[in-house]
Structures are given as structure tokens and as C-alpha cells.
Amino acid sequence: QLPPGKPEIFKCRSPNKETFTCWWRPGTDGGLPTNYSLTYHREGETLMHECPDYITGGPNSCHFGKQYTSMWRTYIMMVNATNQMGSSFSDELYVDVTYIVQPDPPLELAVEVKQPEDRKPYLWIKWSPPTLIDLKTGWFTLLYEIRLKPEKAAEWEIHFAGQQTEFKILSLHPGQKYLVQVRCKPDHGYWSAWSPATFIQIPSDFTMND
């Protein structure tokens, strides 16, 4: 029977800069029941606080709700593991909410084949930003990436769409069924998961771009 091994805070993520969650990996338990607590203070302050919510983020997590989240301050946090034989502490982690944003996937993806009479046909892809993100405040710039491939193909074709919420693709294989998805990321932060997908059948008379 031993003191617990050193835990590690391995990830912090925020869906929208308004809340965030951090997760830790326990060390060895030393063969005894082990309690974990996360404590933090804000840079420039000495007052230590305990994690406000161990439930929302699931096992081995700490969730910071709106009232505990500040964009303009760095959080310095550590996890304490304690059993009957002693304690161990994780390394301190410095967290700036601005840099840990991972949005939810974009919504409302829809894809249509457009065949104007006077121009080349194209694939028109449209989507909406995730609902948790308020782009009107100007705090956020979301960038989008599209991936598509013929249904049976192994390789995805990637297109960067910038800040647009719609995109045109001209070069496609006639007669193929394509799978299309979109994801987003803030200017600082992480890519979202890929959105739910859309299958689209490209007509046989779709003319490839020159």
C-alpha cells in the first residue's frame, strides 16, 4: 500500500469561451481508495479555490460554469490525489480560455447540385455555425473546413472555406455519390468534430471544370 501516483491534467476545452472543462488522468492508486480534488487560482491572485463542479464533465473532470469563467485571466490549476498513505500533486497547468476553445460541429449542413444554364454546374454547400457560439459579439471568428469524397473512396478532398457559411465546388466526378462534412475552429483554438454528413448524387451529365 502506497501513496497515490502523480495525476496529470491532460486537457481543457471550452465550447464558446463562456464555460470550460478540464480533465485529468489519475496516477496509480497505491492500492487504496483515492480522492481527487482540483484547486486553482487566477494569475495575480493568491486565493485558492476548489473546483466548482466535478459532475458535469464526467469522471476525473472539473467544469467551470459561466460565473467561474473569465476570458481575460489565466487560471493556474493542479490536482491533488489523496489516500490513507499520503498525497501527490499534478504539475501546475496554466489555462487561458481564449486558447482552449473547441466548438461544437456546425449545424444544418445541406448540399445541392446547381446547374445554371449559362455557367458550369457546381456543388453548393451550406451550413450554420454551432448554436452555442454568438458570432455577433465579435469575440469570435469561426473558420470552416469542408471535406468530401466519393462514397467508396478512401481519401478525403479538403477545402478551406474561411469565414463563409457556404461554398461552391466545381470539380467533381459525374455519376458519383459524394459524402460531405464540415467542421469549424475559432481563430485561436481547436477544430470541432466533423458535422453529421450529407450524401449527394452527382448527375451523369455534370460537366467537369476545365
Epitope: P105, L107, K126, T131, T198
Partner: antibody
Framework: QVTLKESGPVLVKPTQTLSLTCTVS??????????VSWIRQPPGKALEWLAH???????SYSTSLKSRLTISKDTSKRQVVLTMTNMDPVDTATYYC??????????????WGQGTLVTVSS | DIQMTQSPSSLSASVGDRVTITCRAS??????LNWYQQKPGKAPKLLLY???SLQSGVPSRFSGSGSGTDFTLTISSLQPEDFASYYC?????????FGQGTKVEIK
């Protein structure tokens, strides 16, 4: 209180075009993360998804029926219209409209209309 | 398009029984799987979404599990009002597809 109500003809002749209207209340067709879907169910058979339209006006259609279907919406009238061309007796079914909720890792039909039975017969 | 296969197509059970219905997708759909209940002459009603999230107002005897391609709807203790047809539906990729349904009948 969210409600959806389908309206349209109960009887159409083969080769004719069916036009169904879904009138909604309790939410707006322009609300982010909202949409309306059409689903049908032939007597004694399973549900079949036909089409949907999202708040951003994005549309999707059933692969097998795409060439016959058009979905559109009039946000101010709170209506979504589905048209289906070249009707055939096998299209006899109860046609439902339902609200789509899209959100954080979720996409589902949470409110349904009561359905309207459309019979295709000469 | 993704195919959804439900089993069994029908089952007979008694009040108080534990009932399990399975749904299999022809390819991975993450957790974008919804379950609906339909009674004769009525519109379907949402029970669960995103595989395991219980819709507001639905009794807790209904539960869902699974991700990827294999999903389960469980009714822990069947009640008289639960005799109905149940449908799974994937919303991972359009065109969306429903399972062919499972009819739960009184034994």
C-alpha cells in the same frame, strides 16, 4: 406550445402533383437550429423520410424520390410546403411533418403533426 | 445511403417484462440515433435522441445505448401503455433513414 398541422388534398389522381402544407406554431422557421421534415407511412408499413428544410434554407431530399420532390418555406406565413410530382397509387400514405431540432451533438424530430392520409386513385 | 436494420420485427411480452430492441446501421453513425414510439392511428413520438438522451416527459423505464453501428432500446418494465411500434432513425447523414420497425404485442 409547439404544434404542426398538415393540410392538402386527401385524394389525388395518378400522374397529378401533390402539394402539402405544414403550418407551424410555437416556434419560428427562422430560429437557428430548427427545421421541418416530411415523413410518410404507407398503410401498415414503416416510416419513410422524404425531405427536410433548415432555418438557413438548406434542403435535403430522399435519394429515391429526389427528382419528384420540392420543399420550400414561407417564414412569415409559418408554412413549409412539399410538392411531389407524378403521383402513383404506391404513394398512398399518411404524410407527416415534424420539427427538427439540431444542437450540440443532436439532430432529431421532437414534435410531429397528426398526419394527413393521401390516397392516390383514379 | 445508410441502411438501418431493426430486430426483432415483432415480439410478444407481458406487463412487467424487460424488453430489448436492437438497431444496426450499415456504417458508423457515431451516436446520431433516435428512437420513436408509434401507437395505431397516431403520429410517432420521440423517446430518445443521440442514442441515450431521454426526451423530456418520457418515463425513465425507457433507456438507450450504443454508438457506431449497434444500438439498443430497453424498456425495463413493460407497462400496458407501451404496447406499440418502435422505430429507430439515424440522423448522421442525409438522406435520413428509419428502421423497419418493431411491433411490441401483448403475450
Amino acid at each position: 406550445q409547439v404544434t404542426l398541422k398538415e393540410s392538402g388534398p386527401v385524394l389525388v389522381k395518378p400522374t397529378q402533383t401533390l402539394s402539402l402544407t405544414c403550418t407551424v406554431s410555437g416556434f419560428s422557421l427562422s430560429d437557428a437550429g430548427m427545421g421541418v421534415s416530411w415523413i410518410r407511412q404507407p398503410p401498415g408499413k414503416a416510416l419513410e423520410w422524404l425531405a427536410h428544410i433548415f432555418s438557413n434554407d438548406g434542403k435535403s431530399y430522399s435519394t429515391s424520390l429526389k427528382s419528384r420532390l420540392t420543399i420550400s418555406k414561407d417564414t412569415s406565413k409559418r408554412q413549409v410546403v412539399l410538392t411531389m410530382t407524378n403521383m402513383d397509387p404506391v404513394d398512398t400514405a399518411t404524410y407527416y411533418c415534424a420539427r427538427i431540432r439540431t444542437g450540440t451533438y443532436s439532430l432529431y424530430l421532437d414534435y410531429w403533426g397528426q398526419g394527413t392520409l393521401v390516397t392516390v386513385s383514379s | 445511403d445508410i441502411q438501418m436494420t431493426q430486430s426483432p420485427s415483432s415480439l410478444s411480452a407481458s406487463v412487467g417484462d424487460r424488453v430489448t430492441i436492437t438497431c444496426r446501421a450499415s456504417q458508423s453513425i457515431n451516436s446520431y440515433l433516435n428512437w420513436y414510439q408509434q401507437k395505431p392511428g397516431k403520429a410517432p413520438k420521440l423517446l430518445l435522441y443521440f442514442a441515450s438522451s431521454l426526451q423530456s416527459g418520457v418515463p425513465s423505464r425507457f433507456s438507450g445505448s450504443g454508438s457506431g453501428t449497434d444500438f439498443t432500446l430497453t424498456i425495463s418494465s413493460l407497462q400496458p401503455e407501451d404496447f406499440a411500434s418502435y422505430y429507430c432513425q439515424e440522423s448522421y447523414s442525409t438522406p435520413w433513414t428509419f428502421g423497419q420497425g418493431t411491433k411490441v404485442e401483448i403475450k
